[in-house]
């Protein structure tokens, strides 16, 4: 069920769940933001200060890297 994740526990969970995609600590914002200091929702706010389930954690995974031949 939902649980709070802070510090190393949070990094562990992001590494495991996001895997090769990597992760963000803040949700990416659009380039058209009118203020550089526009408030961002961060994973610490969502998962450490409040409880956080797996699906919410996955929202901080980076998108798939574009497909290209190795």
């Amino acid at each position: 069920g939902p649980e709070t994740l802070c510090g190393a526990e949070l990094v562990d969970a992001l590494q495991f769940v996001c895997g090769d995609r990597g992760f963000y600590f803040n949700k990416p914002t659009g380039y058209g933001s009118s203020s550089r200091r526009a408030p961002q929702t961060g994973i610490v706010d969502e998962c450490c200060f409040r409880s956080c389930d797996l699906r919410r954690l996955e929202m901080y995974c980076a998108p798939l890297k574009p497909a290209k031949s190795a």
Partner: antibody, heavy 118, light 106 residues
Amino acid sequence: QVQLVESGGGVVQPGRSLRLSCAASGFTFSNYYMTWVRQAPGKGLEWVAYISSGGGSTYYRDSVKGRFTISRDNSKNTLYLQMNSLRAEDTAVYYCAREDYGYWFAYWGQGTLVTVSS
Amino acid sequence: DIVMTQSPDSLAVSLGERATITCRASSSVSYMHWFQQKPGQSPKPWIYGTSKLASGVPDRFSGSGSGTSYSLTISSLQAEDAATYYCLQRSSYPPTFGQGTKVEIK
């Protein structure tokens, strides 16, 4: 060098319980999240469970959720898998494995066989 | 869950010949990872990040691919390469492995 040694496997009847252990050495156990992976006889590999470095966070594959519990004792450098309500389909070799970021499932134990049979 | 399908299930190749194993993912993944397993042994990391050989892996092994299709190739099969090879995706939770491909000496 990194060493993982599983124990606790055996033959058990359906519906019964078993606890597996994995003794870790050669690295700072408390710094790493750990996983269990299983392999049914003659079959492929299947991730089973995850536990964070401090033990506060756990995830499970759907088929074992509510029946299996992963835990750890960092003072003893030991990982556990408590398996309840065992089913025939849980018959497998169970491996504990350590991941390094980007080097997934980098280290494996030798495995311990769990046979669920009446 | 992403389903990983390896082909063929098994193949027999003569010593010195080329062997290729394919792994297809049900959805696109960023990278593929490969493990080698011999009977009675635990799996060993073999190829990471689609094409990077794990420590100690001979350079007759190579990996390639992108999107949903990846492959492992042995350019000149040696006796010690007889084993089962598994692919792994770590781009989507939960981690999933292929069913394995058994490589035998003809």
